[in-house]
């Protein structure tokens, strides 16, 4: 979990300040008004690891 | 820390009733959908009932088997989550436990309570 | 509804050596990024933990040992080395719709 200002969120995650932690963009897809989701339209998906 | 304390549960006769309650504490409750699932020998985990949130108007959502007789219902005031069971029958037994997810995986699980439904 | 069926319904695994556990659903649970797949231990007299998220990510504090990968219709959970400590039952579980279903679990026992 990252603070607001430091470190950015790992990939496949954005900081969301309602739960005050990193949150997963896969979660968009159920909850796409949550307050990480913009943050997740620019970062990449974590890859799937195949 | 995460803490889902669960109380409820016991002995109670086919079409009787029972309510199970859920305290949540260590986390933003409000945000979070909450949810029950049982587990039996025969039908192993099985998601029953989800309630949202408030600003969606609390939405459920059912399993088809506990679908007219279960109601789940929350107070975000009290940061609990209810599960009201009517007309309970036999192949209702089971370890029932109160889940928390935000939209995909149940990250916490309260410590399980047991109801028997039996004459 | 979409069903998971998961293989083995147990498995005996010596110390130190690979339990690999499989989950198959009846449809496609991806997107062209994600899987919504997710994987729980659960020892006995206490509720599932949660391990993995969309298919291949660790929660955090669980070991790296603990590695999960597929797409589509196909996971696979892999642990490795085993240890004493993995002796439970694994469970998948789905959240593409509702309902959220689970597999039936996969025992590991330690020879």
């Known amino acids: 979990e990252q603070a607001p200002g430091t470190a950015p969120c790992s990939r496949g995650s954005s900081w969301s300040a309602d739960l005050d932690k990193c949150a997963d963009c896969a979660s968009c897809r159920a909850r796409p008004h949550s307050d990480f989701c913009l943050g997740c339209a620019a970062a990449p998906p974590a890859p799937f690891r195949l | 820390e995460v803490k889902l304390q669960q109380s409820g549960g016991g002995l109670v006769q086919p079409g009787g009733s029972m309510k199970l309650s859920c305290v949540a504490s260590?986390?933003?409750?409000?945000?979070?959908?909450m949810n029950w699932v049982r587990q039996s020998p025969e039908q192993g985990l099985e998601w029953i009932a989800e309630?949202?949130?408030?600003?969606?108007?609390?939405?459920?959502h059912y399993a088809e088997s506990v679908k007219g007789r279960f109601t789940i219902s929350r107070d975000d005031s009290k940061n609990s989550v209810y599960l009201q069971m009517n007309n309970l029958r036999p192949e209702d037994t089971g370890i029932y436990y109160c889940?928390?997810?935000?939209?995909?995986?149940?990250?916490?699980w309260g410590q399980g309570t047991t109801l028997t439904v039996s004459s | 509804d979409t069903v998971l069926t998961q293989s083995p319904a147990s498995l005996v695994v010596s110390l130190g050596q690979r339990a690999t556990i499989s989950c198959r659903a009846s449809?496609?649970?991806?997107?062209?990024?994600?899987?919504?797949i997710h994987w729980y231990q659960q020892k006995p007299g206490q509720p599932p933990k949660f391990l993995i998220k969309?298919?291949?990510n660790r929660d955090s504090g669980v070991p790296a040992r603990f590695s999960g990968s597929g797409s589509g219709t196909d996971f696979t959970l892999n642990i490795h080395p085993v240890e004493e400590d993995d002796t439970a039952i694994y469970y998948c579980?789905?959240?593409?719709?509702?309902?959220?279903?689970f597999g039936a679990g996969t025992k590991l026992e330690l020879q």
């Open positions: 889940a928390c997810r935000y939209a995909d995986y149940f990250d916490h």
């Open positions: 260590g986390f933003t409750f409000s945000y979070y959908w």
């Open positions: 309630i949202r949130l408030q600003s969606n108007d609390y939405p459920t």
């Open positions: 449809q496609s649970v991806s997107t062209s990024d994600y899987s919504y």
């Open positions: 969309y298919a291949s």
């Open positions: 579980q789905h959240s593409w719709e509702i309902p959220p279903t």
